[in-house]
Every structure is written in structure tokens, then in C-alpha cells.
């Protein structure tokens, strides 16, 4: 499900206001508002499943819900890649796959989802309280990452609720692209609406309720998303490799996390639930965007063992050729 701004239906402006605001400034808000409503926030979902046949074997499935083209997917465990996490696999939509133990088989399931089977034996094998993270680099959205883990109480063959502990992070590449333009547009629209609200409007009928107040609230970050700005990633990992830092932040800048409540209704039951569409993490675009400007000096994100991602505005096809001079 895409996260979209829910905006009440707008009433046409009063005739008396048209002269005050001007025809041009009246048209612009409606255009921008349409953009804001339809510019759904991209999301990443993660689903972790323990295989019934091999008790210590896991399958991780991740997907990206966004309109952009995916340029790279990085799967890590023990936390996000670059924040104490260890890369398990890197999947490129044209170039292929690099994977690392205990990954047994990484593959693309669809153009926007991947799966990764982890081996169940050996010193580096996962266990039930391991956190697995999927990071999707896409254009124009930037990088979005979500994490999930299998609850220790889970029965074999059952999967964890999708994305129990998502991370909502967009890198500058996406923010400064289309998303930035949309954000600017939305802020400008909000400014216009506020001006509109505070402007005296003697011709307005007293019985009519002004729609501006709820409209303004539509863009304000929710309490949940505001709280997410201050929650660092923390994993207490006592029995699993790799060991994870108590509090870890991605290199080069802060990260914002949201821990969503897990409802019993979200827990899939048996194979039918495994096949059903996972419920993605929901998040406010504002809560993600606020922290990005601190990362302006950050170098391109490291995307795996010996792998460097060079975002390409032309999408994954453009990445077939050389990516840049080392």
C-alpha cells in the first residue's frame, strides 16, 4: 500500500479572493496539490521466514514499492549496511549478484523484489533474533531501507510480520531530484494556503467551514514520524553472529528509525500467508527528509564488500557502462 497524503476535497475559491490572489497563483496551488497527493512515498518491505525443513535456514524476501527504477539492492544482517551490519548480498538489475556466506542463493523474484536463502549450518549461520535489512537504491527516490527479524517464538515454517522494524531513509540522490521539487512545491502550496487562510474574506458565508485547517494538517508530520526522528537503531544481540553495536548509525550522517507496532493480524499463518502481499512499512516523507541535509557532505554509500554505488539519473540501464574513474 502506498503512503499518500490524505487531503480533503477542496472547495472552489470564493470569487472575491480571485482578484486578491491573482489567477496565476490560484492555478499553481491546484497543480502542486495534485502533485503532492499523487507523489506517494516509496516503501520497502521485508519478510523473514524460517524454513520448516531446515530449522536454521532462513528465507528473506524484500520488495520496493515505488515508481522509480531500482539500481541496486543490498541485503545485510545484524543491522543496516554501514551501521554495524554485514552485507549478505548485492543484487543489480542488469549486472547480476554478489553474495556472501551464509547466503546460499540470492535472486530477483520480480523487477522490484528479491529473495535470499541463507544456509543453516556453520559458525556464521543466522538465528531467530537476527535482524535482516534490505536497502533499495532507486532513482529518483534515493535509497530506502527496511529491516525485519523473526521473533524468537516463531514456529518453523512461519514468517515474521513484514517489516517489523523499518528504517525510512532516503539519500540525497533522490531527495535532490524529483522528490525535492515535490517537497518544495508542497511547502510552497502550504504557504499559499496559510496566506489564504489568514487573508480577510468578507464574502465567505459564516455557515461554510473553511477547509484550510485540515489541509494544513495533511502535510504536518504525525507524532509517530516526529518520534521516529529521535529513535536510534539499537539491537541487543546475545546469541547470534555477527555481533551488532548497541547503538549504530550509518556512516556520514544520522539515520531515522521508526518502530511500528506489530499486530497479531499481520502475522501470516502458513503457506497462504507467505504467498500473500506483505504489508510495507508506512512513513511520512517529511520525517525522512528532515535529516538529509546533514548528509550533504557524505560520500556515495558503500553498498557491499568492495562495491560502490554511483547513482545514475538515467536508471539501471545507464549503469551498464562504466560508472566512473576509480
Amino acid at each position: 500500500m502506498r503512503t499518500e497524503a490524505q487531503v480533503p476535497a477542496l472547495q472552489p475559491p470564493e470569487p472575491g479572493l480571485e482578484g486578491a490572489m491573482g489567477h496565476r497563483t490560484l492555478v499553481l496551488p491546484w497543480v502542486l496539490l495534485t502533485l503532492c497527493v499523487t507523489a506517494g512515498t516509496p516503501e520497502v518491505w521485508v519478510q523473514v521466514r524460517m524454513e520448516a525443513t531446515e530449522l536454521s535456514s532462513f528465507t528473506i524476501r524484500c520488495g520496493f514499492l515505488g515508481s522509480g527504477s531500482i539500481s541496486l539492492v543490498t541485503v545485510s544482517w545484524g543491522g543496516p549496511n554501514g551501521a554495524g551490519g554485514t552485507t549478505l548480498a548485492v543484487l543489480h538489475p542488469e549486472r547480476g549478484i554478489r553474495q556472501w556466506a551464509p547466503a546460499r542463493q540470492a535472486r530477483w523474484e520480480t523487477q522490484s523484489s528479491i529473495s535470499l536463502i541463507l544456509e543453516g549450518s556453520g559458525a556464521s549461520s543466522p538465528c531467530a533474533n537476527t535482524t535482516f535489512c534490505c536497502k533499495f537504491a532507486s532513482f529518483p527516490e534515493g535509497s530506502w531501507e527496511a529491516c525485519g527479524s523473526l521473533p524468537p517464538s516463531s514456529d518453523p515454517g512461519l514468517s515474521a510480520p513484514p517489516t517489523p522494524a523499518p528504517i525510512l531513509r532516503a539519500d540525497l540522490a533522490g531527495i535532490l531530484g524529483v522528490s525535492g521539487v515535490l517537497l518544495f512545491g508542497c511547502v510552497y502550496l502550504l504557504h499559499l494556503l496559510r496566506r489564504h487562510k489568514h487573508r480577510p474574506a468578507p464574502r465567505l458565508q459564516p455557515s461554510r467551514t473553511s477547509p484550510q485547517a485540515p489541509r494544513a494538517r495533511a502535510w504536518a508530520p504525525s507524532q509517530a514520524s516526529q518520534a521516529a526522528l529521535h529513535v536510534p537503531y539499537a539491537t541487543i544481540n546475545t546469541s547470534c553472529r555477527p555481533a551488532t553495536l548497541d547503538t549504530a548509525h550509518p556512516h556520514g550522517g544520522p539515520s531515522w528509525w521508526a518502530s511500528l507496532p506489530t499486530h497479531a493480524a499481520h502475522r501470516p499463518q502458513g503457506p497462504a500467508a507467505w504467498a500473500s502481499t506483505p504489508i510495507p512499512a508506512r512513513g511520512s516523507f517529511v520525517s525522512v527528509e528532515n535529516g538529509l541535509y546533514a548528509q550533504a557532505g557524505e560520500r556515495p554509500p558503500h553498498t557491499g564488500p568492495g562495491l560502490t554505488l554511483f547513482p545514475d539519473p538515467r536508471g539501471p540501464r545507464a549503469m551498464e557502462g562504466p560508472l566512473g574513474v576509480r
Partner: antibody
Framework: EVQLQQSGPELVKPGSLVKISCKTS????????MDWVKQSHGKSLEWIGA????????SYNQKFKGKATLTVDKSSSTAYMELRSLTSEDSAVYYC????????????WGTGTTVTVSS | DIVMTQSQKIMSTSVGDRVSMTCKAS??????VAWYQQKPGQSPKALIY???NRHTGVPDRFTGSGSGTDFTLAISDLQSEDLADYFC?????????FGGGTELEIK
């Protein structure tokens, strides 16, 4: 100039083990993964596995799991491959190959090590 | 495992000719193909990466093309130093697999 200098030929007995080396120079060792490839009968090539020198993470072809073990020594910029429980099927030329992760291919190959298993 | 089939085991050619060799993948591997040249008694050398990009120092007589399952390495104005074995490699999925090789020989 980037070079991958491998250790000399090995003549070993069945059931024994051998450890071959790949000494690198001309680049930063930890910046590139090192893969290993087997060439039998002077023709067919098989990918054995890879190692990330930065953290020692490994990846193996299932066929070579239990047969090959990949390690690195960062201090000497050297990659190693140990082959155990050797049989005549393991007689081959073994290559280390540097994996270019910007362009996704083996851009430089080692000199090759011939392993002959014979009683 | 993905099977890479180089159907022409040996190709007889003459200096100055243009020759094309093929590599067929058992499934769609997008552009995840590289080509290597190996002369007798030597290590393989990189020629082409990501289907169509020439490795540093490789003459433009060598051209790679294709996508999906069918890939081609073409050599124009064949030189005597081009006589060698040529292998394709797929890195789309694990384990990475090579083609059986095509040997270029003089007629």
C-alpha cells in the same frame, strides 16, 4: 602495474591438502574481492568462490564447499586457497582473479598454479 | 546452475577475416556477461565486460553484443595474435559459470 603472482606448481598425494597463494601488488588489496577459478584439462573453467579481503567474508560454489577454503593475509596483501582431501579430479590449474566491483568482471588474473595429484 | 553454451568448439579462420562466436545462456542473464581470451600456456585475459564494454587496452577490433540469452563476440580484421581460446562468463547468478570455450585456429 597490477600483478597477481601465484605460488609454484604442486605435486601432492591423494588425500593430502595443498595451500596455494596469490600475492598481489600495484593496488590496494582490500579494495577488490578476490575470486578463484579452476581450469581442468586445459579448457573448461569453473568458478570456485570469492573472498572480500576487507572483512574475510567468503562465498563458495556449492560444488567446492568442503573442498576449498579461502583466506587472506592483509599484512602481506596475499590471498590463499587451501584444497583438502585431494583426488585426481583436483588436478588442474588454479587461478586467482581480481573482481572489479565497479564494472563487474575479473579484470586481472593471476599467473596460475598447477596442482597435480598423484600417488 | 546457469549453463553457458559456446556451440562452436573450433573456428577455422584466416588473418584479415571477420569472425563471430556465440554464447547462449540457459536463462535470461540481462547484460551480466564477460569475455576472456586465453592463449596457450597463459592465464586468461579480460576482453569484454558487461556484454559490450572493452577492457582497457583491448583493440576496437573486438566487439561484444547481445542481451538476455544470446551473446556474441566479434573480431574484425583478425590478427595472428588473436589465435586463442575465448570464454564467456555469466555473473547473473550463483554459481558464476563459464562457457566451454571457442578455439580460433588458422585454416
Amino acid at each position: 602495474e597490477v600483478q597477481l603472482q601465484q605460488s609454484g606448481p604442486e605435486l601432492v598425494k591423494p588425500g593430502s591438502l595443498v595451500k596455494i597463494s596469490c600475492k598481489t601488488s600495484g593496488y590496494t588489496f582490500t579494495d577488490y574481492n578476490m575470486d578463484w577459478v579452476k581450469q581442468s584439462h586445459g579448457k573448461s573453467l569453473e568458478w570456485i568462490g570469492a573472498i572480500d579481503p576487507k572483512n574475510g567474508a567468503t562465498s563458495y560454489n556449492q560444488k567446492f564447499k568442503g573442498k576449498a577454503t579461502l583466506t587472506v593475509d592483509k599484512s602481506s596483501s596475499t590471498a590463499y586457497m587451501e584444497l583438502r582431501s585431494l583426488t585426481s579430479e583436483d588436478s588442474a590449474v588454479y587461478y586467482c582473479a581480481r573482481w572489479d566491483s565497479n564494472y563487474w568482471y575479473f579484470d586481472v588474473w593471476g599467473t596460475g598454479t598447477t596442482v597435480t595429484v598423484s600417488s | 546452475d546457469i549453463v553457458m553454451t559456446q556451440s562452436q568448439k573450433i573456428m577455422s579462420t584466416s588473418v584479415g577475416d571477420r569472425v563471430s562466436m556465440t554464447c547462449k545462456a540457459s536463462q535470461n542473464i540481462r547484460s551480466a556477461v564477460a569475455w576472456y581470451q586465453q592463449k596457450p600456456g597463459q592465464s586468461p585475459k579480460a576482453l569484454i565486460y558487461l556484454t559490450s564494454n572493452r577492457h582497457t587496452g583491448v583493440p576496437d577490433r573486438f566487439t561484444g553484443s547481445g542481451s538476455g540469452t544470446d551473446f556474441t563476440l566479434a573480431i574484425s580484421d583478425l590478427q595472428s595474435e588473436d589465435l586463442a581460446d575465448y570464454f564467456c562468463l555469466q555473473h547473473w547468478n550463483y554459481p558464476y559459470t563459464f562457457g566451454g570455450g571457442t578455439e580460433l585456429e588458422i585454416k
